[in-house]
Each structure stands twice: as C-alpha cells, then as structure tokens.
C-alpha cells in the first residue's frame, strides 16, 4: 500500500495505491483511491507511467480527456466513471501486455487540493493448476497441468503424509511454449503415489503462487485449487 500526499500544506489530499500484477492477454486493474469531492466536475485524474512520454489516462470534468494519451495505451484504458465521485480513481487496463509492467503514478486534483501515489505493476501469466490421476501410466501417477505461466515457474510436489519429503527424484516437469510464443504450459508428473494421501502441486514465479491439491482414496478423488498473487503492497 502506498499512501501519497499533496505537498502544498493544507491543499493536500491523501491518495492510496496498491501494487498489483496483470495477467497478460487479460484485463487488469491499477488500484487508486482518494479523498472524495462532492463535485465531479472539480476532479482531475491523471495516470502516468515512468518512461512513457504521453499520459496513460486522463479523466476530467466528468469524462475522459485522451488528447495526450500515449499510443501504447490507446483504446485500452478506462476509469470507473460512476465511482470517481466516491474516490475511486482505479484504472482498468485491457489486454495486458508484458510491456505494461513498470511504475505508475496516480495523480489527483480536487477542490480540496492535490495528491499522488506511485504503484508497481508487474505483468506475467499465471493460471490455476489441475491435478488428475493419470490412468494411462503403468504405475500410480498424478499429472498436474496449468495452461499459462510466465516467467517460467518452479514446480514443487508435497504430500500430507510425507511432510518435508523431496519429490524431485520421482517427478518430471516440462514447459511447453504456447502459440503466442510468450506463455508456457506447465505439466508435472508425480510417480509412485500412494492411496489415502493428499498431494499438492505448487507452481510459483515472482508474480503468483498456485496450488493444486488432490486427495486420492479407494472410494473417491477430491480436488482443490487456489491461486495467490505475490507482493500486493499498498502505497
């Protein structure tokens, strides 16, 4: 969390941003809030990116003002216009690109004053893994698949019964480049699994950490997955 203040004494407002990550090819949110104003026409929102000459986005007098918008963001940005009045200056970024990563500034002017805060935006690819029993294999085998990751993640297997065990000798992980030549499909196979145990396939890069769990008993198979973005800090 980054909290910024205006620097002109009493004419300062608090602006708060949260570091976040974008999944390339999907839409992302750059979060920013500020002390609200009662009059929409008095609010100016500017989004800037370090190393980019034009503006990322500008909203003033109740509408977008895109005459100075940088070409790399053309047609890809929007604020939540109906939420500006309550202090939400967050930016929606469509079709996130790897090159969108960097440091952004949310700059606000209201009738109370001005303020700004920076945020770090990371970009990459991350997806939920799915763990299944591989019935085609000669021995009891689990297969963990996740369709889109970038940068290349690490994959670690764990088990509830054999806590702390190292499964690297009995697992095999491969990374297959997807058709857009950036993201990769992750496939990891775990051999010699035992029944009545819960196994976890953990995939992690510097942007996200995802886990796929599978519990195999004689009567049923239970699966669970979750994904967590790393380094979401407020400013």
């Amino acid at each position: 969390l980054i909290i910024g203040f205006g620097i002109s004494g009493r004419h300062s407002i608090t602006v708060t941003t949260v570091a976040s990550a974008g999944n390339i090819g999907e839409d992302g949110i750059l979060s920013c809030t500020f002390e609200p104003d009662i009059k929409l026409s008095d609010i100016v929102i500017q989004w800037l990116k370090e190393g980019v000459l034009g503006l990322v986005h500008e909203f003033k007098e109740g509408k977008d003002e895109l005459s100075e918008q940088d070409e790399m963001f053309r047609g890809r940005t929007a604020v939540f216009a109906d939420q500006v009045i309550v202090g939400n200056a967050s930016l929606r970024l469509k079709n996130v690109q790897l090159t969108d990563a960097g440091t952004y500034k949310c700059y606000i002017i209201t009738s109370k004053g001005k303020g700004n805060a920076n945020l770090e935006y990371k970009t990459g690819a991350f997806s939920m893994p799915e763990v299944n029993v591989d019935y085609n294999a000669s021995s009891e085998t689990l297969r963990c698949e996740a369709p889109r990751w970038f940068p290349q993640p690490t994959v670690v297997w764990a088990s509830q019964v054999d806590q702390g065990a190292n499964f690297s000798e009995v697992s095999n992980t491969s990374f297959e480049l997807n058709s857009e030549n950036v993201t990769m499909k992750v496939v990891s196979v775990l051999y010699n699994v035992t029944i009545n145990n819960t196994y976890s396939c953990m995939i992690e890069n510097d942007i996200a950490k995802a886990t796929g769990d599978i519990k195999v008993t004689e009567s049923e198979i239970k699966r669970r997955s979750h994904l967590q973005l790393l380094n979401s800090k407020a400013s």
Epitope: K49, E50, G51, V52, L53, L55, Y107, K114, N116
Partner: nanobody, 122 residues
C-alpha cells in the same frame, strides 16, 4: 522550472547524418527518463526514442530503429539523438522532452523544448 533547449537541426541530403542535442536545466536530470519526439506540420507529435536516467535502457519507434541512436551525458545535463541514413520522411520539427513521471510533476507542466527543424532534401 524545467527548461529544455534543442539544437543541431538543419538541412541534410538523403542518406546523410545529423546529431541533435538537448540541454536540460531546472530539475535533477539523472533521475529522469528523456525522450525525443517529432512533428510534421499539420500532424501531432510522434514519440521516437527514450533513454532511462542512467542511460542503460533505450528504446525506439519502429520507423527509426537501426538508424537513430539516443544517448545522454549526465555530467553535462545533455541528451543527444544521432540520426543516420536520413530519409525525406524524417523531415520534421524534433523535440526533446522530459519524462512527466517524477515527484515535481504538476498538472499542466510543460515537459517540452521549443524544437529544432530537420529538413531532408536533395
């Protein structure tokens, strides 16, 4: 106050070279990315190149890649654009600009120099 003064423009034949210079003052020069952009009469400014504060990171518009080189001298508060193999379509007013991103940014801040004219003609 941010001040940027460009120089080095002129008339050059196709295939020729020019080196543009930009003298910066009024801000902590080495903390900022610097840019070059150009404008053809009747059209908007078009970004062509940028360089990071430490000079280690550069990038270029496709139209000038391989022909133009941006550089900087932080000791002298100068940024340069070396233009080789110039073409008629490079004819424009060339502007030096400071990155907006910084603690001193304010709404309506002028980050542009006054421009220098480059004419490529035989």
């Amino acid at each position: 106050e941010v001040q940027l003064v460009e120089s080095g423009g002129g008339l050059v034949q196709p295939g020729g070279s020019l080196r543009l210079s930009c003298a910066a003052s009024g801000f902590a020069f080495s903390n900022y990315w610097m840019h070059w952009a150009r404008q053809v009469p009747g059209k908007g400014r078009v970004w062509i190149s940028r360089i990071s504060g430490d000079g280690r990171s550069t990038s270029y518009a496709d139209s000038v890649k391989g022909r133009f080189t941006i550089s900087r001298d932080n000791a002298k508060n100068m940024v340069y654009l070396q233009m080789n193999n110039l073409r008629a379509e490079d004819t424009a007013v060339y502007y030096c600009a400071r990155d907006r991103f910084g603690d001193d940014y304010y709404y309506g801040m002028n980050v542009w120099g006054q421009g220098t004219t480059v004419t490529v003609s035989s």
